[in-house]
């Protein structure tokens, strides 16, 4: 999906009042300082291509955070502010559902949420220059 | 202050159809997403569908139901259910908000899917 006509503003809006809110509540018990923040994005359409990524991607040592409530959120603004976004996602939760019997939190999938947070951290400061 | 009223809601058989109807009035400039949540007995709140310029529906749902609003006014939101399955009996919600919609409520409407 290409998400150069996505209301950004309108997604930073939703991060900040609620998404935010779900992924500090994941994160919880863990020090800020935990994780080194190795993924980057480079302007507003490439980050939310990470975050999509790193949300709804299965990674090694971290199966599923698409059952996440930050996750089922992300995907709602995603889909909101972004038009055509929802026509674009496969049936990839009922999948997942079937895959995963618990939830298991893991120190890779806290790892992958750290550096989540370091994409919208990033994708809400559009203008500044990558380091 | 904003205030969300559903209707529609009703007693339906397998495979027939409802249209909710969800009328905003008040401070209707911050409603700029609004959304269609269901609740059914002993079960999580889940957002069923939502629309700002573009849409989203939940993976159970997808196909079947239908949302929109009133462009014109920006003051109504519909939600077509087609193909019901008794799974969807539930209280339906209507709910806004600036960029997520989950800052406004309405009271709910009752949907009963059932032979």
């Known amino acids: 999906y290409d998400f150069t006509n996505c209301d950004f503003e309108k997604i930073k809006a939703a991060y900040l009042s609620t998404i935010s809110k779900d992924l500090i509540t994941y994160m919880s018990g863990t020090k800020s300082t935990e994780f080194n923040n190795t993924v980057s994005c480079s302007n507003r359409p490439h980050c939310l291509t990470e975050i999509q990524s790193l949300t709804f991607n299965p990674t090694a040592g971290c199966a599923s955070l698409a059952k996440e409530m930050f996750a089922m959120k992300t995907k709602a603004a995603l889909a909101i502010w972004c038009p055509g976004y929802s026509e674009t996602q496969i049936n990839a939760t009922q999948a997942m559902k079937k895959r995963r019997k618990r939830k298991v939190t893991t120190n890779k999938c806290l790892e992958q949420v750290s550096q989540l947070q370091g994409l919208w951290r990033r994708f809400n400061r559009p203008l500044l220059k990558q380091q | 202050q904003l205030q969300l009223v559903e209707s529609g809601g009703g007693l339906v058989q397998p495979g027939g159809s409802l249209r909710l109807s969800c009328a905003a009035s008040?401070?209707?400039?911050?409603?700029?997403?609004m959304g269609w949540y269901r609740q059914a007995p002993g079960k999580e709140r889940e957002l069923v569908a939502a629309?700002?310029?573009?849409?989203?529906y939940a993976d159970s749902v997808k196909g079947r139901f239908t949302i929109s609003r009133d462009n014109a006014k920006k003051n109504t939101l519909y939600l077509q259910m087609d193909s019901l399955k008794p799974e969807d009996t539930a209280i339906y919600y209507c709910?806004?908000?600036?960029?997520?919609?989950?800052?406004?409520w309405g009271q709910g409407t009752q949907v009963t899917v059932s032979a």
């Open positions: 629309i700002g310029s573009g849409t989203y």
């Open positions: 709910a806004s908000g600036d960029s997520y919609p989950d800052e406004y």
């Open positions: 008040g401070s209707i400039f911050s409603i700029d997403a």
